[in-house]
Interface confidence: medium
Amino acid sequence: MACLGFQRHKAQLNLATRTWPCTLLFFLLFIPVFCKAMHVAQPAVVLASSRGIASFVCEYASPGKATEVRVTVLRQADSQVTEVCAATYMMGNELTFLDDSICTGTSSGNQVNLTIQGLRAMDTGLYICKVELMYPPPYYLGIGNGTQIYVIDPEPCPDSDFLLWILAAVSSGLFFYSFLLTAVSLSKMLKKRSPLTTGVYVKMPPTEPECEKQFQPYFIPIN
């Protein structure tokens, strides 16, 4: 076996190495002793865009001429690891994720450009890149240190309909307020003009051409 403990037998995983606090160091120090370990590099931190999109590069040092590669993105939050997405591709071809996958990606040599979409604040976590060289034998496995993806939910934009309602309400309020103000002012003004008399509005004949329809009322005091 060219790579002790990292060879796949039939469908069963014949696996040989476990990972925890210091174990990453254990991997890096001891795997080379009994296996040409495949190193996987990925950025330490990535900030998702306001639209919930995060992109990072996963680069692996291929020990051989692999033709079939499988890339898996694992998310670790708290203590639990879950598979986010996975794609198998033939060297030189595009990565094909499932239709409903939140991941997309492109490959270029030993580099895979991964994009994860639809992220929310609750999706913040460590995203680990796992690369498997499936064919030809021997089978190789490499696991990156993980990329901490931070997702900050944008301030929610108010609904445009809601904004229109607010605008309409404010406009109506201002209109009625100005109407009321005008009425009050006018009544005060009238009271000042003739404190002891009453009066009527009389429609006078037009002074300008009929077509303009501008009727101007005059105040005629009645004794």
Partner: antibody, heavy 124, light 107 residues
Framework: QMQLVQSGAEVKKPGASVKVSCKAS????????ISWVRQAPGQGLEWMGG????????NYAQKFQGRVTITADESTSTAYMELSSLRSEDTAVYYC?????????????????WGQGTMVTVSS | DIVMTQSPSTLSASVGDRVTITCRAS??????LAWYQQKPGKAPQLLIY???NLQSGVPSRFSGSGSVTEFSLTISSLLPEDFATYYC?????????FGQGTKVEIK
């Protein structure tokens, strides 16, 4: 709450191999590490190795390197521990235990859930 | 490998006693230490993780302290069900190693 159920007791002859299974139920099996710990009669606890099914990786204590193989079958949520070239001193109770650990940060809670144990007797 | 040494090996105590078990690591393990309780014929049960954190469901009479190489487990007031064997375990560096155990027996 996850539970770990192990296979029954085994009696083996020196030089033979034994394969003990550990089936998980009530939890996400592949997301956690499963370790194997043994305890010889009247003795203390000894860690043999462990596996993280979703990572597809495991490691072994140097003492057992080359004699132990730990595998996992995600489809049946079962972990296996195979010990070969058995000797009389391998007579022990073999436990599988769930570990909660963090790949990068070191947040970790040791072995929080254990199987009931499998007695393996090596005798000629 | 990191060697874990527990003391005492056996401890005789009475119900209601305050009991302390110590565990020493052969090199620094920071706070990566767990304590387990094991009763005859049963699997161990996690009591304390990361030196001083009480595992969910474990009574508050159990407490852990210490760091670097010196650690201790204290049972504030022994109950009849606390008579068992206690193990410490480091998980700072693989392989994970256990202490040889401390048997708490009835005086």
């Amino acid at each position: 709450q996850m539970q770990l159920v192990q296979s029954g007791a085994e009696v083996k002859k020196p030089g033979a191999s034994v394969k003990v299974s550990c089936k998980a139920s009530g939890g996400t099996f592949s997301s956690y590490a499963i370790s194997w710990v043994r305890q010889a009669p009247g003795q203390g606890l000894e860690w043999m190795g462990g596996i993280i099914p979703i990572f597809g990786t495991a490691n072994y204590a140097q003492k057992f390197q080359g004699r132990v193989t730990i595998t996992a079958d995600e489809s049946t949520s079962t972990a296996y521990m195979e010990l070969s070239s058995l000797r009389s001193e391998d007579t022990a109770v073999y436990y599988c235990a769930r570990e909660i650990g963090s790949y990068s940060s070191g947040w970790y809670r040791a072995f929080d859930i254990w199987g009931q144990g499998t007695m393996v007797t090596v005798s000629s | 490998d990191i060697v874990m040494t527990q003391s005492p090996s056996t401890l005789s105590a009475s119900v209601g006693d305050r009991v302390t078990i110590t565990c020493r690591a052969s090199q620094s393990i920071s706070s990566w230490l767990a304590w387990y309780q094991q009763k005859p014929g049963k699997a161990p049960q996690l009591l304390i993780y990361k030196a001083s954190n009480l595992q969910s469901g474990v009574p508050s009479r159990f407490s852990g302290s210490g760091s670097v190489t010196e650690f201790s487990l204290t049972i504030s007031s022994l109950l009849p069900e606390d008579f068992a064997t206690y193990y410490c375990q480091q998980y700072s560096r693989p392989p994970w190693t256990f202490g040889q155990g401390t048997k708490v027996e009835i005086k």
